[in-house]
Amino acid sequence: MVPPPENVRMNSVNFKNILQWESPAFAKGNLTFTAQYLSYRIFQDKCMNTTLTECDFSSLSKYGDHTLRVRAEFADEHSDWVNITFCPVDDTIIGPPGMQVEVLADSLHMRFLAPKIENEYETWTMKNVYNSWTYNVQYWKNGTDEKFQITPQYDFEVLRNLEPWTTYCVQVRGFLPDRNKAGEWSEPVCEQTTHDETVPS
C-alpha cells in the first residue's frame, strides 16, 4: 500500500493558491504526486506525477467553492486521495499593504498601497476584489507599549500635532468590515518628527 500525502493544506496569500503537502515515509523508493481540482463533477489534473510537494491552483475562480485532492504514487500503485475544500475569496490571507511615510514637521503623512493580487498580470489589487476594503493603522511612540488605532477613510492619512523630535512607528493592514476579516500587518515604519511649526505670538 502507498501511504497518502500528509499535512495537506492550502497556502493562499492574495489569491496565490498553493496546495502543499508532505511526502510520507515510504521504503520502496521515491513517490510522485498527482493533484486535481473538481470542475463540474469531473476531477481535472493540475499537477501530474510531480516530485514536488506543492501545486499552484491560482487560476481557480476567486469566488467558487473548490474541491481539491492529491494522492501519492509509486510505479503502478497509488494511495487514497486526500481531499480539501477551499473558497479563495473567503480563505485567502490578506497580505500586508505597502505604505509610504513622510515627515512634515510634527506630522506624519502616510499613503497606503493595497496588496497586489499575486497571480494576475495587471494591476488589480485586493481592494478591487473586496468592496468593503478599508485600512487599519496603528501607531505608537517608539519604545512605548501604548498603541493607537485609526481607520482612515481614504488611501492616505495624516497624523498631526505629534510631539516634536520624537520617533513614531506606524503599521497598516487591510480590513474587511463586512467579513470582520483582518489582513496581516505591514512591517513597522519608524520616523522622527521634527520641530513644531507653530509660530510663537
Epitope: 470542475s39 475562480s61 467558487g64 473548490h66 497571480n119 498580470y121 488589480w124 478591487n128
Partner: nanobody, 126 residues
C-alpha cells in the same frame, strides 16, 4: 454582484452561422475574464472560447478557425461569432465571467469562473 444574460441562440442548418451575445452588469466590465462554455445533453460542460481583460484569446481545438470571441467594453457585452456550424456544436451555450483577472491562463475550464449565465440553446441540424 455580476449578472450575465445570454441571447442569440436558435436553430440553424449545418454550415450556417450564429452570433451569441452575453450582456454583463456588475463590476468594472473591462476587468473581466470571460468565456463561452457549452454542454450537450449527457455530456460535461466544456470550454469553447475565452478572452482575458487584456484582450488575449484562447479556443478549444474543436472550434478553432470557425468561432471568434470578442467583447465590447463600451456595451458591456461579450460575443461569440459561430460559423461553419456542425451538428456536434448542438448544445446549451453558457457565458461565464471572472472579475479582476487577466491573461496567463487558458481560462477554458469551468472552475476558473465564478459567475455564470443561464444559457442559450444552439441546435444545428444536418
Amino acid at each position: 454582484q455580476v449578472q450575465l444574460q445570454e441571447s442569440g441562440g436558435g436553430s440553424v442548418q449545418a454550415g450556417g452561422s450564429l452570433r451569441l451575445s452575453c450582456a454583463a452588469s456588475g463590476y468594472s466590465y473591462s476587468s473581466y475574464c470571460m468565456g463561452w462554455f457549452r454542454q450537450a445533453p449527457g455530456k460535461e460542460r466544456e470550454g469553447v472560447a475565452a478572452i482575458a481583460s487584456d484582450g488575449s484569446t484562447s479556443y478549444a481545438d474543436s472550434v478553432k478557425g470557425r468561432f471568434a470571441i470578442s467583447k465590447d467594453n463600451a456595451k458591456n457585452t461579450l460575443y461569440l461569432q459561430m460559423a461553419s456550424l456542425k451538428p456536434e456544436d448542438t448544445a446549451m451555450y453558457y457565458c461565464a465571467a471572472e472579475p479582476w483577472c487577466t491573461g496567463g491562463y487558458s481560462r477554458l475550464t469551468p472552475a476558473e469562473y465564478g459567475y455564470w449565465g443561464q444559457g442559450t440553446q444552439v441546435t444545428v441540424s444536418s
